[in-house]
Interface confidence: low
Amino acid sequence: AQGKEVVLLDFAAAGGELGWLTHPYGKGWDLMQNIMNDMPIYMYSVCNVMSGDQDNWLRTNWVYRGEAERIFIELKFTVRDCNSFPGGASSCKETFNLYYAESDLDYGTNFQKRLFTKIDTIAPDEITVSSDFEARHVKLNVEERSVGPLTRKGFYLAFQDIGACVALLSVRVYYKKCPELLQGLAHFPETIAGSDAPSLATVAGTCVDHAVVPPGGEEPRMHCAVDGEWLVPIGQCLCQAGYEKVEDACQACSPGFFKFEASESPCLECPEHTLPSPEGATSCECEEGFFRAPQDPASMPCTRPPSAPHYLTAVGMGAKVELRWTPPQDSGGREDIVYSVTCEQCWPESGECGPCEASVRYSEPPHGLTRTSVTVSDLEPHMNYTFTVEARNGVSGLVTSRSFRTASVSINQTEPPKVRLEGRSTTSLSVSWSIPPPQQSRVWKYEVTYRKKGDSNSYNVRRTEGFSVTLDDLAPDTTYLVQVQALTQEGQGAGSKVHEFQTLSPEGSGNLAV
């Protein structure tokens, strides 16, 4: 951004009203008026080129410094060529000297040369020769000098003539400011340019309305150079949540849009299942019945708990049940559905019901299931079971309603006993069996049926309350078909599969375990 100039003194604009002090009084510098373009112009001129040892001073009025640290002095002047005077005027000069003096008060007409410090010798780039002068075509020179740092309340400038023919048309004194600036959504105030050329004044910016420094970001800063130029921007501001960048400002998100954090991104349209947001929304409120899980980004549509599992079946197989279901018809808009299975049992005789608790076994842990089936085993015979399968997702915890479906099943038979041959001889077979412990209390007796293989006309039955039996009076080297069935108060349970066991031949040794 271009530097801004603040004028402290402008001789040309003052119309001869300034009344500068000349020394010695009445000699040397003189205020003159000319007409240019039908306008009066004023100038201080001196032209004592024929006399030697000139020391003519022109001092400005006292200039209040204000906030300036470094001042710039722009001079517009003409200098006549010494050769344009008769004999070349041996004492003639073509330069003059520029001085300044700082003071805290106006000394008025009390002029003391010793208080002044030389700034520079001012030499023209172009001198006005005789022919130019006669044609009223003077060569105007422009020179600029700067002084700083200034520390007192005010200052004077002085021009020392040492024998030149000079006309001073314009003296303009100003200081420079870096102008007010909006950059990177930060406002930088108008700042006085520093006084030291190498140094850059660091200026802190303030974020525009509704802009903030991003977390971990640098505060906005710029550097104001001596010439009033802004340099080296550092850091930036971003539009805060609910606002987006529009040119150099942060504008509230329009209704129906939102922005959830300070960022460079624009406002986003409210996602599905949100209400029309008001202006400046940082998020879009969910529709009634829809929610956001804590980990959901604001840009994600609002979601709701799933509906119940769509279709649930419980297929009994002896003392086992396979539960199968299909996913909810409405997922709630989420993919993080999990299922949990709970179980109740009811005694038909008493009508009592209670939790299954530890009396059943699941093929996998019954909570947090992602598959849509599970097998429940170790069920008791002649018991009614109710299974509840609940579907949940990431927002189910935000509402009190739950999404579940139930299925009931009656277990009419015990689990088939698992049968093994414990030992055998030429005339006997020792057989044992087991059933799940929860079912054992329901069993009254076990019935063991056996017959010779291939003889379908006759079979033998043995009943026992225990878990083993020895079958005697068997034929040697003969295969028998053996089946065990539990008997409950309500009738027969499921029978075991039919096993083939063979007695030993007479040559074999007795009672060998198979």
């Epitope: 029309p276 008001p278 009634e288």
Partner: antibody
């Protein structure tokens, strides 16, 4: 400019019904939730609930479930508060208030004073 | 419900003085979004409440900058840097992080 203009004062007997209106102007009615706030004489402010003007869904604070009904006439940009079976403790000034954000209110109606007296 | 406790109940001030009103909540008002939904209203006699400050420190449009809000968690303060005659009335704090509730009010009056 944005305005919420409520119906005038009401004098009712216990057991009667009152319906207070709140007419909105100067903004898109359906873009802002409308809340209702009760101020009993010499008492503080008590939030009664709000109505989602976009979908017409009312939400009631626990103390205002039952006899209180929020409703809308969207075409007229008007919200209503109806109180059934008036009781003495319903005597108060009722304000409608537009929601700037979740339950903070940038514009309020001038209030409707309800006197319940037998 | 969250209880909002305001102190003092009455605040006599001289015009031009600074005034400070405190509001304490029975639960933290930090919302899951990270925002704190604590607001201040002014109710002048015979008028409806007017929003002054929302979300702790956001001054509402048209509210003079002599009003400022600060605080976090459960403790909040409304400051008026130089009280003017038009500032007199009852100030209410309110929270909407949970079910909305209001403080009992602080009456600002001339000393």
């Amino acid at each position: 400019q944005i305005q919420l203009v409520q119906s005038g004062p009401e004098l009712k007997k216990p057991g009667e019904t009152v319906k207070i209106s709140c007419k909105a102007s100067g903004f898109t009615f359906t873009n802002y939730g409308m809340n209702w706030v009760k101020q009993a004489p010499g008492k503080g402010l008590k939030w009664m609930g709000w109505i989602n003007t976009y979908i017409g869904e009312p939400t009631y604070a626990d103390d205002f479930k039952g006899r209180f009904v929020f409703s809308l006439e969207t075409s007229a940009s008007t919200a209503y508060l109806q109180i059934n079976n008036l009781k003495n403790e319903d005597m108060a000034t009722y304000f409608c208030a537009r929601e700037l954000g979740p339950y903070y209110f940038d514009y309020w109606g001038q209030g409707t004073t309800l006197t319940v007296s037998s | 419900d969250v209880v909002m406790t305001q102190t003092p109940l009455s605040l006599p001030v001289s015009l031009g003085d600074q005034a400070s009103i405190s509001c304490r909540s029975s639960q933290s008002l930090v919302h899951s979004s990270g925002n704190t939904y604590l607001h201040w209203y002014l109710q002048k006699p015979g008028q409806s409440p007017k929003l002054l400050i929302y979300k702790v420190s956001n001054r509402f449009s048209g509210v003079p900058d002599r009003f400022s809000g600060s605080g976090s968690g459960t403790d909040f303060t409304l400051k008026i840097s130089r009280v003017e005659a038009e500032d007199l009335g009852v100030y209410f704090c309110s929270q909407s992080t949970h079910v909305p509730t209001f403080g009992s009010g602080t009456k600002l009056e001339i000393k």
